[in-house]
């Protein structure tokens, strides 16, 4: 958790986040671990620290090494380590395993491939996507925000997908590429312990007082017909129907999808006219089947009037 691997290609931008999380007001100092030498914060440097972020603009092979970040509150210092490796660009098309981000799997309907680490960068849409070094073309491929959507996925769609985007820093542009493998599931029906795709565990959802808000509980249970599978919301450990707040209702979203895909269920929690007291509640997304129950907790926080991007993933 507090030692994180990061990698990039020479002459591309690489931005690394301190694995230690702190409040925005806490100071973060970065050091070269081997020499204990402080990393400068001045943006004129090719490698510089910017709060929780360490920026290589652009990266060089010689930058490889372990970097220490120390997050300082008034009374506590907490340390994280970033293990950075910068590789030379490959002359051929093959992307070696050590440059690959985590493999994602898809099924026939609405497969999404997220562009890894993109949230750390100052980029503008659209992303460019490549499969095995070939630019993706055709109506089946849709670049949407930070992910690629492939319609009607086939087994032939498996392969290595690279996203390419431009990071802008003080008017200067730097290229970034990231690659991950995509596999297409084609197994017989099976049942798994529920996997909640959304919300993330302990997610903080920003809402505006007086406005409506929707929370989606989305979970997958395996493939094929599921004999017992359910998703539901609880408020402070109580079923929505028993909670007795008419402003807060749940309704089923997208039903199970069986055509070569995972069996998944959505349940949407609709909060009408969000009130202050709603921020005090604990919202639990529950997914259960014959294997057991999984719970992800969401909390609401008031949306700031000025919506600046969080420095956290």
């Amino acid at each position: 958790k507090f030692s994180k691997q990061s990698w990039g290609l020479e002459n591309e931008a690489l931005i690394v986040r301190c694995p230690r999380q702190g409040k925005p007001s806490y100071t973060v100092d970065w050091y070269y671990s081997q020499t204990n030498k402080s990393i400068p914060t001045q943006e004129r440097n090719r490698v510089f620290a910017s709060g929780q972020l360490l920026k290589f603009l652009p990266a060089a092979v010689a930058d490889s090494g372990i970097y220490t970040c120390i997050v300082r509150s008034p009374t506590f210092n907490r340390t994280g380590y970033a293990n950075v490796t910068i590789y030379k660009k490959q002359s051929d098309c093959n992307v070696p395993d050590y440059l690959m981000y985590s493999t994602v799997s898809g099924s026939e309907k609405n497969s999404k491939i997220y562009c890894p680490t993109i949230d750390l960068y100052n980029w503008t849409a659209p992303l460019e996507w490549f499969k095995n070094c070939q630019a993706l073309q055709g109506s089946r491929y849709r670049a949407h925000k930070s992910f690629l959507v492939i319609d009607n996925v086939m087994t032939e769609d498996a392969g290595d997908y690279t996203c390419k985007f431009i990071h802008n820093e003080n008017g200067a542009n730097y290229s970034v590429t990231a690659t991950r493998s995509f596999t297409v599931k084609d197994e017989q029906g099976f049942s798994l312990f529920p996997v909640i795709g959304a919300p993330a565990q302990n997610e903080i959802k920003e809402v505006e007082i007086g406005k409506n808000a929707n929370l989606t509980c989305s979970a997958c249970f395996g493939k094929g017909t599921q004999f017992l599978a359910a998703v539901l919301w609880q408020l402070n450990g109580t079923k929505i129907t028993d909670f007795g707040e008419p402003r807060i209702q749940q309704e089923e979203g997208q039903n199970q999808s069986f055509s070569n895909g995972l069996a998944c269920l959505d349940m949407v929690l609709r909060i009408a006219d969000v009130k202050e007291e709603d921020l005090l509640l604990q919202y639990d997304c529950l997914a259960l089947n014959l294997h057991g129950l999984r719970r992800h907790t969401v909390r609401l926080s008031r949306k700031n009037p000025i919506d600046h991007h969080s420095i956290y993933c």
Epitope: K1, Q21, R78, T79, I204, E276, Q282, S301
Partner: antibody, heavy 123, light 107 residues
Framework: EVQLLESGGGLVQPGGSLRLSCAAS????????MIWVRQAPGKGLEWVST????????AYADSVKGRFTISRDNSKNTLYLQMNSLRAEDTAVYYC????????????????WGQGTLVTVSS | EIVLTQSPATLSLSPGERATLSCRAS??????LAWYQQKPGQAPRLLIY???NRATGIPARFSGSGSGTDFTLTISSLEPEDFAVYYC?????????FGQGTKVEIK
């Protein structure tokens, strides 16, 4: 100097209610998550509840969920624990404590504690 | 929830001796583990955070080590004021949980 002072404990019958208070001083109260921890006589420590600095997010131990409510008044630098439907097993010394790191979605240690207030649930 | 198991339950030692207290987690807590000292009639006092960092004002004879599931609190040379109950606590996820405590008593 950071100080936390609990009050409101006492003897209450099963099924009854009690409201504990914790007066804080010596630090910017609204910037810190606050926690209630309890300790049954001769037993170990048990986390009860946490409230984020802005007061909008709370978390509870399963043993008290639905019966206890944590709240805070940042203008008064005071933390509260409203305890309803009290049971004999809620008998304990209740401590309020401060989480000095408190980033959203994460927890940390408790660096300052009050001296505690005893709650006895008995008929 | 993550269960923390402390051992031994009681440690009988003399002043000047070395004390070694163990805390084992039911699943990995990385280094999100703290140690507290509690004396009779008093609130707990933070000794160690992030498994190995001494809190402000804690004497150097207290040290923590470990990561993942196995942790150790070591008191290199017991002073008379060190005889107390020691608790470990994990804070990687809610609910926050404590070990059942180890009592360090005078032999």
């Amino acid at each position: 100097e950071v100080q936390l002072l609990e009050s409101g404990g006492g003897l209450v019958q099963p099924g009854g209610s009690l409201r504990l208070s914790c007066a804080a001083s010596g630090f910017t109260f609204s910037s810190y998550d606050m926690i209630w921890v309890r300790q049954a006589p001769g037993k170990g420590l048990e986390w009860v509840s946490t409230i984020r600095g802005e007061g909008g997010t709370t978390a509870y131990a399963d043993s008290v969920k639905g019966r206890f409510t944590i709240s805070r008044d940042n203008s008064k630098n005071t933390l509260y624990l409203q305890m309803n439907s009290l049971r004999a097993e809620d008998t304990a010394v209740y401590y309020c404590a401060r989480d000095p790191w408190s980033t959203e979605g994460s927890f940390f240690v408790l660096d300052y504690w009050g001296q505690g207030t005893l709650v006895t649930v008995s008929s | 929830e993550i269960v923390l198991t402390q051992s031994p339950a009681t440690l009988s030692l003399s002043p000047g001796e070395r004390a070694t207290l163990s805390c084992r987690a039911s699943q990995s807590v990385d280094d999100d583990l703290a140690w507290y000292q509690q004396k009779p009639g008093q609130a707990p006092r933070l000794l160690i955070y992030d498994a190995s960092n001494r809190a402000t004002g804690i004497p150097a004879r207290f040290s923590g080590s470990g990561s993942g599931t196995d942790f150790t609190l070591t008191i290199s040379s017991l002073e008379p004021e060190d005889f107390a109950v020691y608790y470990c606590q994990q804070y990687i996820t809610a609910p926050l949980t404590f070990g059942q405590g180890t009592k360090v008593e005078i032999k």
